[in-house]
């Protein structure tokens, strides 16, 4: 083919076209050249900048057998999934001889239905509690107007006239669905539909009604639950761990709590089988058909002390001359509190009972006196806490000591210290 008379004329015989479409579109831009001699490498430009990592392929075919014959070169730039960042002016650049040649420009534009950057999400809310939902969409083309829908009913008369990106909902009394429509010149896109589940409000005013050593009675005020009646409330009780501790509002207890369900109403529950004189933390949540409320904060409570559940054991009472020796061991049964001491009572067959507070000692020496007219002297011991006395031991007879065997007592007992209390015997 005859050569061109103007060597500086562009070798391009095809330029990039225009691609305008929605996100995700796949397209190809092409440049075509017819050059004499060695075909050049084709570079792609976007907005005047070389695309270093372009997904391009170059095909070159000689039109003759001579080295100086013409070559056809086609460079194809593939845009795999159109994004906003792909938009711009595209050109091809070749270096031929001592000259640069740039093709005519083609344009890539993003234009289609609105594209959501943010859509309303499913969530749970407490009844009659304000919350916000978010929706954001973009073109091009702009502008994009949003229209919110609640249970498929528009919340404004026309797009762009109601709330836009953030929808403030003052409160719901029933589970509802929300979506948003994005409108632009190309049409309408509808977001996902978010389900807003209405749960009961957190119960309020969790408090103790009564306390017993192994039992606590608690009550609370239920929160609003919308149109859904409460089905039950759940109470959790947790032994307080002094090392870990349960902070107010801590999301999860450090170990498995005791969980009880309460039918409602009444909004009250008796917790039994507790340890006396023990700190606990309790919390409550109430449930409707839609699900449970959030838990209340952990409330610290404590069972009061109880009396020891059993008497001291292994009581021995022996006389040696003018003295009687009595000793015993701590009750094996639970003390139900802090042991404050022991009470000892002794009594002859026809004499009044004498009561002594021994304190925390587990033995006592009694001075014996009299003419031996008192017989069948017996001793009883009880442990006590701040809550009172535990059960008394069975009467133990005071026997005279002799080697290998206790000896009977023939004298009255004279206590070494005055009794602190004088209580009825049984």
């Amino acid at each position: 083919a005859p050569r061109g008379t103007q060597a500086e004329e562009s070798p391009f015989v095809g330029n990039p076209g225009n691609i305008t479409g929605a996100r995700g579109l796949t397209g190809t831009l092409r440049c075509q050249l017819q050059v004499q001699g060695e075909p050049p490498e084709v570079h792609w430009l976007r907005d005047g900048q070389i695309l270093e990592l372009a997904d391009s392929t170059q095909t070159q075919v000689p039109l003759g057998e001579d080295e100086q014959d013409d070559w056809i070169v086609v460079s194809q730039l593939r845009i795999a999934s159109l994004q906003l960042s792909d938009a711009g002016q595209y050109q091809c650049l070749v270096f031929l001889g001592h000259q640069n040649f740039v093709s005519q420009p083609g344009y890539v534009g993003l234009e289609g239905l609105p594209y959501f950057l943010e859509e309303p999400e499913d969530r749970t809310v407490a009844a009659n509690t304000p919350f916000n939902l978010s929706c954001q969409a973009q073109g091009p083309p702009e502008p994009v107007d949003l229209l919110w829908l609640q249970d498929a009913v528009p919340l404004a008369t026309a797009p762009g006239h109601g709330p836009q990106r953030n929808l403030h909902v003052p409160g719901l009394n029933k589970t509802s669905s929300f979506s948003c429509e994005a409108h632009n010149a190309k049409g309408v896109t509808t977001s996902r539909t978010a389900t807003i589940t209405v749960l009961p409000q957190q119960p309020r005013n969790l408090h103790l009604v009564s306390r017993q050593p192994t039992e606590l009675e608690v009550a609370w005020t239920p929160g609003l639950s919308g149109i859904y009646p409460l089905t039950h409330c759940t109470l959790q009780a947790m032994l307080s761990d002094n090392e870990v501790g349960i902070q107010a509002g801590e999301p999860d207890p450090p170990e498995e709590p005791l969980t009880l369900q309460a039918s409602v109403p009444p909004h009250q529950l008796r917790l039994g089988s507790l340890h006396p004189h023990t700190p606990y933390h309790i919390r409550v949540a109430c449930t409707s058909s839609q699900g449970p409320s959030s838990w209340t904060h952990w409330l610290p409570v404590e069972t009061p002390e109880g009396v020891p559940l059993g008497p001291p054991e292994n009581i021995s009472a022996t006389r040696n001359g003018s003295q009687a020796f009595v000793h015993w061991q701590e009750p094996p049964a639970p003390l139900q509190g802090t042991l404050l001491g022991y009470r000892l009572a002794y009594q002859g067959q026809d004499t009044p009972e004498v009561l002594m507070d021994i304190g925390l000692r587990q033995e006592v020496t009694l001075e014996l006196q009299g003419d031996g007219s008192v017989s069948n002297l017996t001793v009883c011991v009880a442990a006590y806490t701040a809550a009172g006395d535990g059960p008394w031991s069975l009467p133990v007879p005071l026997e005279a000591w002799r080697p290998g065997q206790a000896q009977p007592v023939h004298q009255l007992v004279k206590e070494t210290s005055a009794p602190a209390f004088s209580w009825p015997w049984w």
Partner: antibody, heavy 120, light 107 residues
Amino acid sequence: EVKLVESGGGLVQPGGSLKLSCAASGFTFNSYSMSWVRQTPEKRLEWVAYISNGGGRTYYPDTIKGRFTLSRDNDRNTLYLQMSSLKSEDTAMYYCARGTTESYYALDYWGQGTSVTVSS
Amino acid sequence: DIVMTQSHKFMSTSLGDRISITCKASQDVITAVAWYQQKPGQSPKLLIYWASTRHTGVPDRFTGSGSGTDYNLTISSVQAEDLALYYCQQHFSTPLTFGAGTKLELK
């Protein structure tokens, strides 16, 4: 509206010459490459010549090379095809056509054609 | 030279039918294929170029496809005004070459 109007066709004897013109309007003539394509009486389409927008590059098929010359006057928005050494197989309807921007060799607008008959 | 072969000189169709006209290139033309429509007494009109790019104003019932050496022009629902002569052309390299044409006619 893009408009291409060919003229200059007619009856010519074998070995004779003829100059065809194509007047362009409705677009920026000097921005587009142009081609001539002919259609034989049997309705076959044959490419005749190509010229770049500035006129610096011309291409012809081997059957035409050396006998026809394509030129353009961008000031007059006119394309010319000088034909010489005409043969009977050159008898056809001659169309001028504009190349697309995306491929100058794909032809987006054609004139109504001018008829050339080579016969003794 | 690249030879473009349209294997059917004639194709019969009914209105509303979907029809595909085929064209085969003698070598890979990198999708540089154009399709033209010519009605009696008129000049050819460009329908498709780069195998699948629809020219301005062409109804979207016309679709081009193909790659390598095999190309198709599909009319999704033939209308009366589509009855015409259809040519393929490679616009990959000079010399530009056309197929012999396929005439679309009613059954």
